[in-house]
């Protein structure tokens, strides 16, 4: 029950996290430009990964794609890439984890398969979260190093007069959304990995074993107990307590002439 709860919670937390990463990637407020020391603030400017926006004092707001004549900074391209990789990995992770959920039955899927899928999705969520956190952190660093406390003269309108203002680029809401979302995805991934340990059948679990008496083709299956005879070759480097006993699958896969009791 605890495993199912951990897995389910991990899935939900990751889902919220990935939704947040998508939201952050699409948001326009990655950096905002505060204008102060200005009696009449002409514009409030903010930028996202894809476009730049201007809000005039009248309330009129307009967003436009970046002016790429001079090219886009490599850092911006790297952040875009990190966020997209994070979203793609997260989306694949969600898809895998849906099928891995213990509460959902799909055909005769075994717990071992679900455990593997849970681990896979968990790792994907962890990498996805790390990509988002890295992307947002790179952008924040770019803001701090390149744009913090810059000054400008603002000339408004065609043939407009000089209006001196000081601009300061600050962290936009998207950065905080991205950090939180990345963290949630990471936590969700860790929870999925923890749940995987509970789902995976232990090596010491009792397996149904087949015994072949010489000259007979009768398979005797004790009710889930693992018996050890101490006989049989250990050529497959099996643990010695397995003895000559093999699971039904192993018997089918590796027929042997030396299984005696």
């Amino acid at each position: 029950m605890a495993v199912t709860a951990c897995q389910g919670l991990g899935f939900v937390v990751s889902l919220i996290g990935i939704a947040g990463i998508i939201a952050a990637t699409c948001m326009d407020q990655w950096s905002t430009q505060d204008l102060y020391n200005n009696p009449v603030t002409a514009v409030f400017n903010y930028q996202g990964l894809w476009r730049s926006c201007v809000r005039e004092s009248s309330g009129f707001t307009e967003c436009r794609g970046y002016f790429t004549l001079l090219g886009l900074p490599a850092m911006l391209q790297a952040v875009r890439a990190l966020m997209i990789v994070g979203i793609v990995l997260g989306a694949i992770g969600l898809l895998v984890s849906i099928f891995a959920l213990k509460c959902i039955r799909i055909g005769s899927m075994e717990d071992s398969a679900k455990a593997n899928m849970t681990l896979t999705s968990g790792i994907m969520f962890i990498v996805s979260g790390l990509c988002a956190i890295a992307g947002v952190s790179v952008f924040a660093n770019m803001l701090v190093t390149n744009f913090w406390m810059s000054t400008a003269n603002m000339y408004t309108g065609m043939g407009g007069m000089v209006q001196t203002v000081q601009t300061r680029y600050t962290f936009g809401a998207a950065l905080f959304v991205g950090w939180v979302a990345g963290g949630l995805t990471l936590i969700g991934g860790v929870m999925m990995c923890i749940a995987c340990r509970g789902l995976a059948p232990e090596e010491t679990n009792y397996k149904a074993v087949s015994y072949h008496a010489s000259g007979h083709s009768v398979a005797y299956k004790p009710g889930g107990f693992k018996a050890s005879t101490g006989f049989g070759s250990n050529t497959k480097n099996k643990k010695i307590y397995d003895g000559g006993a093999r699971t039904e699958d192993e018997v089918q896969s590796y027929p042997s002439k030396h299984d005696y009791v």
Epitope: V43, S52, E56, Y66, G71, L72, A152, M158
Partner: nanobody
Framework: QVQLVESGGQSAQAGGSLRLSCTAS????????MGWYRQAPGKERELIAA?????????KYAESVKGRFTISGDYAKKTLYLQMNSLKPEDSGVYYC???????????????WGQGTQVTVAA
């Protein structure tokens, strides 16, 4: 730090033509347009032409230069141009290139400025 560099400024006769160029030493984040400003002796710096991310169709001009000046960009050369035709003596001044923010209503300058290039138009 990214720097904008203007060139092409020189002396010309009234009625003549000049083409100013503006190139950058690197790429600039966050801009949605670029503009050309003119500062005549003893006057304030004024915006005379601007271009937005929509390309050559996304342009604005001051009334004093409409029909005579054309702003354009060469994406392959990463250069902004100002083609100035039918020059007048009042077009004289220092021309500055700027990277800023364009809207359908207006152009707002950003933090990046060139050092300026002098244009002198003789009568």
């Amino acid at each position: 730090q990214v720097q904008l560099v203007e060139s092409g400024g020189q002396s010309a006769q009234a009625g003549g033509s000049l083409r100013l160029s503006c190139t950058a030493s690197g790429s600039i984040f966050g801009i949605s347009g670029m503009g050309w400003y003119r500062q005549a002796p003893g006057k304030e710096r004024e915006l005379i032409a601007a271009i937005g991310s929509g390309g050559d169709g996304d342009t604005k001009y001051a009334e004093s230069v409409k029909g005579r000046f054309t702003i354009s960009g060469d994406y392959a050369k990463k250069t902004l141009y100002l083609q100035m035709n039918s020059l007048k003596p009042e077009d004289s001044g220092v021309y500055y290139c700027n990277a800023g923010f364009m809207t359908s209503r207006n152009y707002y300058n950003g933090d990046y400025w060139g050092q300026g290039t002098q244009v002198t138009v003789a009568a």
